[in-house]
């Protein structure tokens, strides 16, 4: 007799995804030799652990502290680009500024960037049928509460002036209800944080508007005086110009605003 | 079994372009890293760059910074490295190159290479 | 980057006889792991290189176990206790430490 098995609102587990997890993890290892002291194999061991026969309405923090601490990794602390809803963006800029580093760029995040997971309570299985939606089921599952605590360990980490690239073409341009809004914003440390620096990506050709002092962007500048850090945005234009511009400096053409 | 074919022999001008391609089977295309070495006639063999086929992403030698573009189409389990502004010091063999991965670690050894691909850069 | 010097860069044997090559790396190859960061290739005529050894001292699948490789952080050697005529063609360390990964000069081995 088939077992009952929980229907959940979101899609399930992505397919291959342990295998997909070892491999990203070996690959990582293999171009970031820093990182080669790093088993994968217990990687992948502490990464089931987290959700595996746990209920996936029922993950903790708690419950990723063994893969947290397998993933530990240092970036410079004053190259950190984090970003809301523009991640392919914000990619493309640390893949060409190779100094600077969005969480997809450590260990940790580039294991589990747009993968979905999730397991059944009491049962070793992974479940590839569906997991739980943050919104019409609930917000501790596996892969929302695995975001929250590397988001607020990456925002812990920061320090000197942090950059964050927003959505210039959404009507939220800064959402409260974002990762970055609601984790990273809330855990940059006041101590070693001096700047936090907005850059608003514009969507449209010809949109001059100076997207800084849209309503969600002053919303952003408030919280984060109120936390004692200083706040700076620059509107970015032309975002393939911008890239381009990252890729040659030198270029006559990269003088005038971008 | 594992395979990397790569494209014919090119002869090309000074100053043009070549895309020389490696086409993946009998593994995960996504799962490995891909390298591109190079070997000009009598010489010793040379470190171009890698592409996480992935996510497309890349890293390139300083040297050839400026002039090579690695790319992939993982529809295909292909990929291909572009090599611009030609000069008669590009007339090499280029080989796509993989690691062997043992028991979850990067060998860091390149187990399996293409077949090669002879560009010849004439005047 | 990392330069690897190879030696002797021509190497005559004859059948049977064992064979010794030399690597020696500019910086310490050893990580932090515990592996060290060295490979051995042998490639034949006309033939794209072949891995025979990585780590310094594993042979790579298939490798025949006349080929052993040692050393310590800088200093390497491939050994081949008996020298077969298959053997011939040019034999390359390499590092992969950190990137680039470089190659030696390469040693040429015919047979006498």
């Known amino acids: 007799v088939p077992r009952w098995r929980q229907q959940w609102s979101g899609p399930g587990t992505t397919k291959r995804f342990p295998e997909t997890v070892l491999a990203r993890c070996v690959k990582y290892t293999e171009i970031h030799p820093e990182m080669r002291h790093v088993d994968c194999q217990s990687v992948w061991d502490a990464f089931k652990g987290a959700f595996i026969s746990k209920h996936p309405c029922n993950i903790t923090e708690e419950d990723y502290q063994p893969l947290m601490k397998l993933g530990t990794q240092t970036v410079p602390c004053n190259k950190i680009l984090l970003w809301s809803r523009i991640k392919d963006l914000a990619h493309q800029f640390t893949q060409v500024q190779r100094d600077m580093f969005t969480l997809e760029d450590t260990l940790l995040g580039y294991l589990a960037d747009d993968l979905t997971w999730c397991g059944e309570f009491n049962t070793s299985k992974i479940n590839y049928q569906s997991c739980p939606d943050w919104r019409k089921d609930c917000s501790n599952n596996p892969v929302s509460v695995f975001w929250k605590t590397v988001s607020r360990r990456f925002a812990e980490a920061a320090c000197d002036v942090v950059h964050v690239m927003l959505n210039g073409s959404r009507s939220k341009i800064f959402d409260k209800n974002s990762t970055f809004g609601s984790v990273e914003v809330h855990n940059l440390q006041p101590e070693k944080v001096q700047t936090l620096e907005a850059w608003v990506i514009h969507g449209g050709r010809e949109d001059s508007r100076d997207l800084c002092q849209d309503p969600t962007i002053k919303e952003l500048e408030s919280i984060i005086s109120k936390r004692n850090i200083q706040f700076s945005c620059k509107n970015i234009y032309r975002p393939d110009k911008f890239l381009q511009c990252v890729k040659n400096p030198e270029d006559s053409s990269c003088t005038s605003e971008i | 079994q594992m395979q990397l074919v790569q494209s014919g022999a090119e002869v090309k001008k000074t100053g043009s372009s070549v895309k020389v391609s490696c086409k993946a089977s009998?593994?995960?295309?996504?799962?490995?890293?891909m390298h591109w070495v190079r070997q000009a006639p009598g010489q010793a063999l040379e470190w171009m760059g890698w592409?996480?086929?992935?996510?497309?992403?890349?890293d390139y030698a300083q040297k050839f910074q400026d002039r090579v573009t690695i790319t992939r189409d993982r529809s295909m389990s292909t990929a291909y490295m572009e090599l611009s502004s030609l000069r008669s010091e590009d007339t090499a063999m280029y080989y796509c190159a993989r690691v062997a991965i043992i028991t979850t670690v990067a060998s860091g050894g390149f187990a399996y290479w293409g077949q090669g691909t002879l560009v010849t850069v004439s005047s | 980057d990392i330069v690897m010097t190879q030696s002797p860069l021509s190497l005559p044997v004859t059948p049977g006889e064992p064979a010794s090559i030399s690597c020696q790396s500019s910086?310490?190859?050893?990580?932090?792991?515990?592996?060290?960061?060295l490979n051995w290739y042998l490639q034949k005529p006309g033939q794209s290189p072949q891995l025979l050894i990585y780590?310094?001292?594993t042979r790579a699948a298939g490798v025949p176990d006349r080929f052993s490789g040692s050393g310590s952080g800088t200093d390497f050697t491939l050994k081949i206790s008996r020298v077969e005529a298959e053997d011939v063609g040019v034999y390359y360390c390499?590092?992969?430490?950190?990137?680039?990964?470089?190659f030696g000069q390469g040693t040429k081995l015919e047979i006498k």
């Open positions: 009998g593994y995960t295309f996504t799962d490995y890293i």
């Open positions: 592409i996480d086929p992935e996510y497309g992403s890349t």
């Open positions: 390499q590092q992969f430490l950190e990137y680039p990964p470089t």
């Open positions: 780590w310094m001292s």
């Open positions: 910086e310490s190859l050893l990580h932090s792991n515990g592996k060290t960061y």
